[in-house]
């Protein structure tokens, strides 16, 4: 639709956007599976979480993610001082005081025990590229992904719209 | 200013075709979902059709899936709705809307254009 | 399909007269739930979204609560200008759909 430069284009103000108010306007509780419906699990191991794509057993119960949603204020390409649109960031916690984290250096997605106001690692832009799909991009690198690799969750770069739909960028929320 | 213009409407015969565009400035126009809705004469308000902001996603409900196609032209800052083998029932004052967040569907319309009248009869 | 079912579909009230409005949805789905108002000859016009949130430059005496099923639109205070029909629409499951309509007249 708007190839790489436009990527690029809308991706470039991430940076620069702004949360506003520290309260989110909505809080919502939901499984996460991937576009091929392996569920997101967290398992406590050694003292530290660890995430893992799997398929679950037929009665298993999915594990639960609390998305918090934030109004993110965009500026104005055109004039510079404008607002030109919102976007919406999510944080997302599986258990009490444990929230996803971005670590860009090492591309990959962890969790991390912190207290708020949580940093910007640990929040993520929120795209809709299906009805009922959602993609995760990094607050802190935009233009990257939470994508799945090898049955782990994984920071991947997407460098085209075409791209942007590829089904390992892919979620799925539920409620059940 | 955000502004939603359409055109196109009209009145055609029962099995014809129209194509509605809407013209939308004061955004980036490349970074929304883009939806038409329709309104039936003294009726209530009906989803048409979605677009994903890539543009690599359309939707529709059952009454026009097959015979409604929605495209964009970003390079344009266009929206369009052709309609194809068209009914009675089709006839409505047609409006373009934009998504309130950039990438994604969540939080309802908050800009409506004007409306353009479809009126399909013999 | 999500079937949305909005009551009453009209009332007559008077200004200053405290309003409001159901929204009871067929199945449970997260808050992506928007409150609309349309005058005669008009565009529909956002008031609420996220089932709470007002909409820019919207009069603060407008306000939207509920969550699973059930969500609710209260005028505070009515006023002249509020008399016009309401809509509430979900945003969580495709199709989209919208209530029927609720009209609001001068009693």
């Known amino acids: 639709a708007f190839g790489i430069s436009g990527v690029q284009k809308y991706t470039r103000a991430l940076h620069d956007s702004s949360i506003t108010g520290i309260s989110p306007i909505t809080e919502y509780l939901a499984s996460l599976s991937t576009y091929n419906d392996q569920s997101i699990t967290f398992a406590l191991e050694d003292e530290s979480y660890e995430i893992y794509v799997e398929d679950l057993k037929k009665d298993e119960k999915k594990d639960k993610v609390l998305l918090s949603y934030y109004e993110s204020q965009h500026p104005s390409n055109e004039s510079g001082d404008g607002v030109d649109g919102k976007m919406l960031m999510v944080t997302l916690s599986p258990t009490k005081d444990f929230w996803l984290h971005a670590n860009n250096k090492e591309h990959s997605v962890e969790l991390h025990k912190c207290e708020k106001p949580l940093p910007d690692q640990a929040f993520f832009v929120l795209h809709n590229m299906h009805s009922n799909c959602v993609s995760f991009e990094c607050k802190t690198d935009p233009g990257v992904f939470i994508g799945v690799k090898d049955n782990h969750l994984a920071l991947i770069k997407v460098d085209s719209s075409e791209n942007l739909c590829t089904e390992n960028i892919l979620f799925k929320l539920s409620e059940t | 200013e955000v502004q939603l213009v359409e055109s196109g409407g009209g009145l055609v015969q029962p099995g014809g075709s129209l194509r509605l565009s809407c013209a939308a400035s004061?955004?980036?126009?490349?970074?929304?979902?883009m939806t038409w809705i329709r309104q039936a004469p003294g009726k209530g308000l009906e989803w048409v059709a979605s677009?994903?902001?890539?543009?690599?996603?359309?939707y529709y409900p059952d009454s026009v899936k097959g015979r409604f196609t929605i495209s964009r032209d970003d390079a344009k800052s266009s929206l369009y709705l052709q309609m194809n083998s068209l009914r009675a029932e089709d006839t409505a004052v047609y409006y373009c809307?934009?998504?309130?967040?950039?990438?994604?569907?969540?939080?309802?319309?908050?800009?409506w254009g004007q409306g353009t009248l479809v009126t399909v009869s013999s | 399909d999500i079937q949305m079912t909005q009551s009453p579909s009209s009332l007559s009230a008077s200004v200053g007269d405290r309003v409001t409005i159901t929204c009871l949805a067929s199945?449970?789905?997260?808050?992506?739930l928007a409150w609309y108002q349309q005058k005669p000859g008009k565009s529909p016009k956002l008031l609420i979204y996220a089932a709470s949130r007002l909409q820019d430059g919207v009069p603060s005496r407008f306000s939207g609560s509920g969550s699973g099923t059930d969500f609710t639109l209260t005028i505070s205070s009515l006023q002249p200008e509020d008399f016009a029909t309401y809509f509430c629409?979900?945003?969580?499951?495709?199709?989209?759909?919208f209530g029927g309509g609720t009209k609001v007249e001068i009693k």
């Open positions: 004061g955004f980036t126009f490349n970074n929304y979902w």
């Open positions: 199945e449970g789905f997260s808050n992506d």
């Open positions: 809307t934009r998504a309130n967040y950039y990438y994604n569907t969540y939080g309802g319309f908050p800009y």
């Open positions: 629409q979900q945003g969580s499951k495709y199709p989209l759909t």
């Open positions: 677009i994903t902001y890539t543009g690599g996603g359309t």
